[in-house]
Interface confidence: low
């Protein structure tokens, strides 16, 4: 466990021409606040995907009113750090999104209005316990300068906050099987602390906070014996000893959602639906009011004037969740077939189909030849949203309407002369050559090269090509 800390140093116009207008005015004074979203790994997920490592909101900055005619200066910032606590190991590589929000303080109907000024994102490697890292990110004409670090919360230590250290019980040595805690040589590695309540007889852990069951036991705390009489479990590998399905650990086992949140499984993890007044990956953040700006993605916060009363986020189209934190992404199910482009419009799903395909989900391969007539005995050939005609001999063009000139390609070799004929073409060969296309030289001794000339035709006679 530990805390990711973010310190915003400045937010203002970036270098170069085209300085942005100040976000505040005399008519609409405003103040800034920041939101940070952290995800494990070097993911390139959409900004709206869950902040699996956690998220935090800053306090509001001082009220600012633009001075007429003056360029936008660095804007006044909120005090203090943004802190994102993480319960499990620090992943070492992470992705961040930092959003700068503007709160307009004019006479807004229904309270203050929020709008997103800038969003920056990045992917970084960072060891816990290291020094502050400085960064500069640009979003359009704006520039954000900030520092960040990850630190472990005692008793965790190490670059991933997975090693636990305790003060030595004796000045000279650590307990059995436990080593000194470098670099804190006056402390000792502590035994792993498994999930609270994990059965000491039937469970064990390799990471802090987990509870893995020995064979024959199941449940979130390994306290439930595997039944040999019922084989109805929907999950888990088959047990070699009983022939039954042994329930594997499900992501919602033990309900990781705090404060009355309900857990639902996702393909790779879990998702908590939090009651009003709580949010966070596990509904662990509480005491939230509308003043904290808990509604993301332009959601409108209503109610919740004090920590004891709930707030409600009214989400804009395309977002859902108690804090409008989830994007309704129906395109992730890839509903458009045959390479169609999926458009999630919020109210509706539309597919833009590639040429040759149609239907609400591009499921229909259009009959390219429907209503397409090929003239003069040609046959229609479908392909990739277009049609073409395979023309009968002597005809060409897109619809076989053009009478082909069989001599246009100069088919007669070795100086032979070409004559168009109702069934094709005829080559009149130059002396010394024969064949349908005058392709065979006549040998000096009078014998022709294969194939032999048909009986009754002398070399040099016109050869009709059928």
């Amino acid at each position: 466990a530990g805390v990711f800390e973010l310190q915003i140093h400045s937010f203002g116009p970036g270098p170069g021409p085209g300085a942005p207008r100040s976000p505040c005015s005399a008519r609409l004074p405003c103040r800034l606040f920041f939101r940070v979203c952290l995800k494990p790994g070097l993911s390139e997920e959409a900004a709206e995907s869950p902040c699996a490592l956690g998220a935090a909101l800053s306090a509001r900055g001082p009220v600012y009113t633009e001075q007429p005619g003056a360029p936008a200066p660095d804007l006044p910032l909120p005090d203090g750090l943004l802190q994102v606590p993480f319960r499990d190991a620090w992943p070492g590589t992470f992705s961040f999104i930092i959003e700068t929000w503007r709160e307009e303080l004019g006479d807004q109907i229904g309270g203050p209005a929020w709008s997103l000024l800038a969003r920056v994102a990045g992917r970084r490697r960072l060891a816990a316990g290291g020094p502050w890292a400085r960064d500069i990110q640009r979003a359009g004409a704006w520039e954000l300068r900030f520092s960040y670090r990850a630190r472990c919360e005692p008793p965790a230590v190490g670059t991933a906050c997975t090693r636990l250290c305790r003060p030595r019980s004796a000045p000279s040595r650590c307990g059995p099987g436990l080593r000194p805690c470098a670099p804190l040589e006056d402390e000792c590695e502590a035994p792993l602390v498994c999930r609270a309540g994990c059965s000491p007889e039937h469970g064990f852990c390799e990471q802090p906070g987990e509870c893995r069951c020995l064979e024959g036991w199941t449940g979130p705390l390994c306290t439930v014996p595997v039944s040999t009489s019922s084989c109805l479990s929907p999950r888990g590998p088959s047990s070699a000893t009983t022939g039954c399905l042994v329930p594997g650990p499900g992501p919602c086992d033990g309900n990781p959602c705090a404060n009355g949140g309900s857990c639902s499984e996702t393909p790779r993890s879990f998702e908590c639906t939090c009651p009003r007044g709580f949010y966070g990956l596990r509904c662990e953040v509480s005491g939230v009011t509308c003043a904290d700006g808990p509604c993301f993605n332009g959601g409108l916060c209503v109610g919740g004037a004090d920590p004891d009363s709930a707030y409600i986020c009214h989400c804009p189209p395309g977002f859902q969740g108690s804090n409008c934190e989830k994007r309704v992404d129906r395109c992730s199910l890839q509903p458009c077939r045959n390479g169609g482009l999926c458009l999630d419009l919020g109210h509706a799903l539309r597919c833009r189909c590639r040429a040759g395909f149609a239907g609400p989900r591009c499921e229909h391969d259009l009959d390219d030849c429907a209503g397409r007539a090929c003239a003069n005995g040609g046959t229609c050939v479908e392909g990739g949203g277009a049609h073409r005609c395979s023309c009968a001999l002597g005809f060409g063009g897109r619809d076989c309407r053009e009478r082909a000139d069989p001599c246009a390609a100069r088919p007669c070799a070795h100086g032979g002369r070409c004559y168009a004929h109702f069934s094709g073409l005829v080559c009149a060969c130059a002396p010394g050559y024969m064949g349908a296309r005058c392709e065979f030289p006549v040998h000096p001794d009078g014998a022709s090269a294969l194939p032999a000339a048909p009986p009754g035709l002398r070399p040099g006679d016109p050869q009709r090509y059928l």
Epitope: L345, G346, A348, C351, R354, A358, C362, L366, D367, G371
Partner: antibody, heavy 119, light 106 residues
Framework: QVQLQQWGAGLLKPSETLSLTCAVY????????WTWIRQPPGKGLEWIGE???????NYNPSLKSRVSISVDTSKNQFSLKLSSVTAADTAVYYC?????????????WGQGTLVTVSS | IQMTQSPSSLSASVGDRVAITCRAS??????LGWYQQKPGKAPKLLIY???SLQSGVPSRFSGSGSDTDFTLTISSLQPEDFATYYC?????????FGGGTKVEIK
């Protein structure tokens, strides 16, 4: 050449059900949105809804509780039913063909049917 | 999505250059078409996808714009062009038309 021919009752009493049918001649019936659009006298156009040859429908929310569009692929026809009509439903009703994939461009239209609702 | 067309009517002479604008209440990319309607007739498609000329439509008709602001331009008005023109967005359901622009002879 694609042609859309439409027919149906032209005079209704309030609370009755409007029923119109559109037949498609020439061209493919699959691969298009088959659409109904209406135009009150002297006013602009209003999209009512659409259906695909497989029966998928989309309706205008302002009419959704009263409207139903169906399709008969064996006859290359699609139909509109609008229940509980009032004088506000008096309009010229058009059927049209909308293309998939390149915007619902309505490239072929029926001749229009004037439906009058009057007691 | 509301589509606001302007002007609602205009008077022009044969040979004039005429521009009609359509504004969407939110971004609709280029999912917009223009239709011409004459009295007692069904509308006729002129432009689709904001700027693509429908087959068989004279080249004096052109469309431009994207996102929220769109324009239909008739480069040289002909006698047969006097009619009412409508824009249509098909970015989102329900599909919505503009209020129409009536082009009359001056």
């Amino acid at each position: 050449q694609v042609q859309l021919q439409q027919w149906g009752a032209g005079l209704l009493k309030p609370s009755e059900t409007l029923s119109l049918t559109c037949a498609v001649y020439g061209g493919s019936f699959s691969g298009y949105y088959w659409t109904w659009i209406r135009q009150p006298p002297g006013k602009g156009l209003e999209w009512i809804g659409e259906i695909t040859h497989s029966g998928s429908t989309n309706y205008n929310p302002s009419l959704k509780s009263r409207v139903s569009i169906s399709v008969d692929t064996s006859k290359n026809q699609f139909s509109l039913k609008l229940s509980s009509v009032t004088a506000a439903d008096t309009a010229v009703y058009y059927c049209a063909r909308g293309e998939y994939g390149s915007g619902s461009r309505f490239d072929y239209w029926g001749q229009g049917t004037l439906v009058t609702v009057s007691s | 999505i509301q589509m606001t067309q302007s002007p609602s009517s205009l008077s022009a002479s044969v040979g004039d250059r005429v521009a009609i604008t359509c504004r969407a209440s939110q971004g609709i990319r280029d999912d917009l078409g223009w239709y011409q309607q004459k009295p007692g007739k069904a509308p006729k498609l002129l432009i689709y996808a904001a700027s693509s000329l429908q087959s068989g439509v004279p080249s004096r008709f052109s469309g431009s714009g994207s996102d929220t602001d769109f324009t239909l331009t008739i480069s040289s008005l002909q006698p047969e062009d006097f009619a009412t023109y409508y824009c249509l967005q098909d970015y989102d359901y329900p599909l919505t038309f503009g209020g129409g622009t009536k082009v009359e002879i001056k």
